[in-house]
Interface confidence: medium
C-alpha cells in the first residue's frame, strides 16, 4: 500500500478514495515532495505582500513586500514599513536618529558613529543622521615628512555636525 503511494510524484497526492492512485493537487495547492496524502495550501500574497513567484503544483508561491515596505524573516514572512535614511522604525512610527547615531538605509536601527579616536585617527568628515563619520589619518601620519593626500579636518569628537 505504502509502495504505491511512494510512486506519486511532486505535484500530486496519493488519493485514498480512488485506490491509491496519484491525483493532481487541487487548485491553489502544491506538493514539493512525492508520496504525500495531501497537498499544501499555496501561500497567498495579500495586503502588504505582493506575489514574486506564482504557486505551481510543485512549488509554493513566493511573496515580496509592496512599495514602502521591506521583507523580514525567512521567506519574507513579514513586511516592515520603510523609513527614510536617517530614521529608524519604533512602535510609534519612523523617528529621526538621535544625535551621534546614523542609519544609511530605509530599514534597521540607528547605529552610533564610529569613534575615530579609538583607532588613533581623527575625524575627516563629520557624521550626520544618514552617514557615519569618515576617519582620517592619525595625527602621527600627518607629522612633517609624512605624505598625505588629504588635509586633516578639525578634530571634533565624536564627529559632531549640526543636525
Amino acid at each position: 500500500l505504502q509502495d504505491l503511494c511512494s510512486n506519486c510524484p511532486a505535484g500530486t497526492f496519493c488519493d485514498n478514495n480512488r485506490s491509491q492512485i496519484c491525483s493532481p493537487c487541487p487548485p491553489n495547492s502544491f506538493s514539493s515532495a512525492g508520496g504525500q496524502r495531501t497537498c499544501d495550501i499555496c501561500r497567498q500574497c495579500k495586503g502588504v505582500f505582493k506575489t514574486r513567484k506564482e504557486c505551481s503544483s510543485t512549488s509554493n508561491a513566493e511573496c515580496d513586500c509592496i512599495s514602502g515596505y521591506h521583507c523580514l524573516g525567512a521567506e519574507c514572512s513579514m513586511c516592515e514599513q520603510d523609513c527614510k535614511q536617517g530614521q529608524e522604525l519604533t512602535k510609534k512610527g519612523c523617528k529621526d536618529c538621535c544625535f551621534g547615531t546614523f542609519n544609511d538605509q530605509k530599514r534597521g536601527i540607528c547605529r552610533p558613529w564610529t569613534n575615530c579616536s579609538l583607532d588613533g585617527k581623527s575625524v575627516l568628515v563629520n557624521g550626520t543622521k544618514e552617514r557615519d563619520v569618515v576617519c582620517g589619518p592619525s595625527p602621527a601620519d600627518l607629522s612633517p615628512g609624512a605624505s598625505s593626500a588629504t588635509p586633516p579636518a578639525p578634530a571634533r569628537e565624536p564627529g559632531h555636525s549640526p543636525q
Epitope: C5, F13, N17, P26, P27, N28, T38, C39, D40, I41
Partner: antibody, heavy 118, light 111 residues
Framework: QVQLQQSGAELARPGASVKMSCKAS????????MHWVKQRPGQGLEWIGY????????IYNQKFKDKATLTADKSSSTAYMQLSSLTSEDSAVYYC???????????WGAGTTVTVSS | DIVLTQSPASLAVSLGQRATISCRAS??????????MNWFQQKPGQPPKLLIY???NQGSGVPARFSGSGSGTDFSLNIHPMEEDDTAMYFC?????????FGGGTKLEIK
C-alpha cells in the same frame, strides 16, 4: 485503526501559555497535514491553521497568527499547538483533525478543553 | 474571508421525513470545476464527523440517506429518511480559500 489522541484538559491563568498535543496512530503521520479547529461552548467552529509534518510548512488563520504556534515531532507522530497570552476568549475545546486529499477533515481528535480563569 | 450562512438555524423533522439544510457562501467556493464544500455532523460532547466532501461525495461509512448537492455559492444537505440518530448539529465548511471557514450550524431535532 486511524486515531488522533489529544492531551487532557488544561486550566490556565490569564496571560499564561498552554501546549496541547495530538498523537497520531494507525497511519503514516508525515503523509497527512494536521489541522487545528477551535470551538467555544455552544458556538461554531473556527479554523486555526495547519502543519505539514514532513516539511513543517504551516499556514495560519490571520486571526490566530499571534495566538497559536503549531509544531510537529515526526519521531513520536505527534502534533502540538501552543496558545499564548491566554484570555477568557481562549476558553474553548480545541480539536486536531487530519486532512484528507480532497481537503476535508476525515479524522478528528476528541478535543482538548482549555479553561482560562483567574 | 468567505462567510458561510446556514439556514435554518434549527429544524424539527418527523421520523422518516426529509430534512434539508442550506448553506450559502459569500462568494463562489468552486475552482476548476471542484466545489470545496464539506458537511459535518456533531453530537454533544463529540468531535464533528465528516458526512459529505466536495459538495456531493459521501464520506467513508456514511449512510446513503445523507446526500449533498450544489455548486458555486448555494449548497444543501439532505437527510432522508430522518432517523432518531440524526439528532445533532450540522455544519458546512469551505476549503477553497484561507482562512477555511465553517457555517454557524443548524440544530436538527425530531418533531
Amino acid at each position: 485503526q486511524v486515531q488522533l489522541q489529544q492531551s487532557g484538559a488544561e486550566l490556565a491563568r490569564p496571560g499564561a501559555s498552554v501546549k496541547m498535543s495530538c498523537k497520531a496512530s494507525g497511519y503514516i503521520f508525515t503523509t497527512y497535514a494536521m489541522h487545528w479547529v477551535k470551538q467555544r461552548p455552544g458556538q461554531g467552529l473556527e479554523w486555526i491553521g495547519y502543519i505539514n509534518p514532513t516539511t513543517v510548512y504551516t499556514i495560519y488563520n490571520q486571526k490566530f497568527k499571534d495566538k497559536a504556534t503549531l509544531t510537529a515531532d515526526k519521531s513520536s507522530s505527534t502534533a502540538y499547538m501552543q496558545l499564548s497570552s491566554l484570555t477568557s476568549e481562549d476558553s474553548a475545546v480545541y480539536y486536531c483533525a487530519r486532512l484528507g486529499g480532497h481537503w476535508y477533515f476525515d479524522v478528528w481528535g476528541a478535543g482538548t478543553t482549555v479553561t482560562v480563569s483567574s | 474571508d468567505i462567510v458561510l450562512t446556514q439556514s435554518p438555524a434549527s429544524l424539527a423533522v418527523s421520523l422518516g421525513q426529509r430534512a434539508t439544510i442550506s448553506c450559502r457562501a459569500s462568494e463562489s467556493v468552486d475552482n476548476y470545476g471542484i466545489s470545496f464544500m464539506n458537511w459535518f455532523q456533531q453530537k454533544p460532547g463529540q468531535p464533528p464527523k465528516l458526512l459529505i466532501y466536495s459538495a456531493s461525495n459521501q464520506g467513508s461509512g456514511v449512510p446513503a440517506r445523507f446526500s449533498g448537492s450544489g455548486s458555486g455559492t448555494d449548497f444543501s444537505l439532505n437527510i432522508h429518511p430522518m432517523e432518531e440518530d440524526d439528532t445533532a448539529m450540522y455544519f458546512c465548511q469551505q476549503s477553497k480559500e484561507v482562512p477555511w471557514t465553517f457555517g454557524g450550524g443548524t440544530k436538527l431535532e425530531i418533531k
